[in-house]
């Protein structure tokens, strides 16, 4: 018969033949062949394979580092990474959970809507029109533009979300 | 290194004061907003004070408002928690922090007890 050019679903090709993939928190020892199906071996303690799989070597599960506030939130399996989480009181610098802050701060542009609490982080928003942030903050709000007509000046540089307007003295030429 | 040592901590009686510091180093301290937090025996952070890298503008807790006053000094690499009319619940580890508010930045904190 023809060798096959593509396999069934868990399956791989290999040396023109259809092998059987290692299920999830399975490595592979060997390929299948013509007489022998696929050898697989379970992952050791602290690894992990969490899908079906030729890999030879497991995944070490992510260490939750307390030196960066980490703790585990659910310990991994043979087929389930660690899940880390931050100390009570901290939040998550991202969505992988690799470190912990005490509150993230808002970036130039945008102004603080709600200060960070122990089981909320930092909200922020953008500064609207006429108004500003030049600064990274965790508790400033967005500042309104300055107004030049109530100290008797002319704008002579427009406002953005990240910079006060430039007053300057008004034109003496006009009548 | 970033390094925030606090100190100024002790044993108060209600309505007394006392002023913590928090002596940073290890990078450039003038214009990074910094924060005062505390932790009460066997509760969770919270937020104190904070004060923009300018100096120019403060947060207070609703708790120590009209109570605490924060503080820079840049040429002295210092940060200050002024404490007056202190109570029983201002109890607590205080900690200073600096942005970007990282936990290995996270300083020993300073104890301080208010009881008569």
């Known amino acids: 018969p023809e060798p096959p050019t593509a396999c069934r679903e868990k399956q791989y090709l290999i040396n023109s033949q259809c092998c059987s993939l290692c299920q999830p928190g399975q490595k592979l020892v060997s390929d299948c062949t013509e007489f022998t199906e696929t050898e697989c071996l379970p992952c050791g303690e602290s690894e992990f394979l969490d899908t079906w799989n030729r890999e030879t070597h497991c995944h070490q599960h992510k260490y939750c580092d307390p030196n960066l506030g980490l703790r585990v939130q659910q310990k991994g399996t043979s087929e389930t990474d660690t899940i880390c989480t931050c100390e009570e009181g901290w939040h998550c610098t991202s969505e992988a959970c690799e470190s912990c802050v005490l509150h993230r701060s808002c970036s130039p542009g945008f102004g603080v809507k709600q200060i960070a609490t122990g089981v909320s982080d930092t909200i922020c928003e953008p500064c609207p029109v006429g108004f500003f942030s030049n600064v990274s903050s965790a508790f400033e709000k967005c500042h309104p533009w300055t107004s030049c007509e109530t100290k008797d000046l002319v704008v002579q540089q427009a406002g953005t979300n990240k910079t006060d307007v430039v007053c300057g003295p008004q034109d003496r030429l006009r009548a | 290194e970033v390094q925030l040592l606090e100190s100024g901590g002790g044993l108060v009686q209600p309505g007394g004061s006392l002023r913590l510091s928090c002596a940073a180093s290890?990078?450039?301290?003038?214009?990074?907003e910094m924060w005062w937090v505390r932790q009460a025996p066997g509760k969770g952070l919270e937020r104190v004070s904070?004060?923009?890298?300018?100096?120019?503008?403060?947060y207070y807790a609703d708790s120590v408002k009209g109570r605490f006053t924060i503080s820079r000094d840049d040429s002295k690499n210092t940060l200050y928690l002024q404490m007056n009319s202190l109570r029983a619940e201002d109890t607590a580890v205080y900690y200073c922090a600096k942005e970007p508010y990282s936990y290995d930045y996270w300083g020993q904190g300073t104890l301080v007890t208010v009881s008569s």
């Open positions: 290890g990078f450039t301290f003038a214009g990074y």
């Open positions: 904070a004060i923009s890298g300018s100096g120019g503008s403060t």
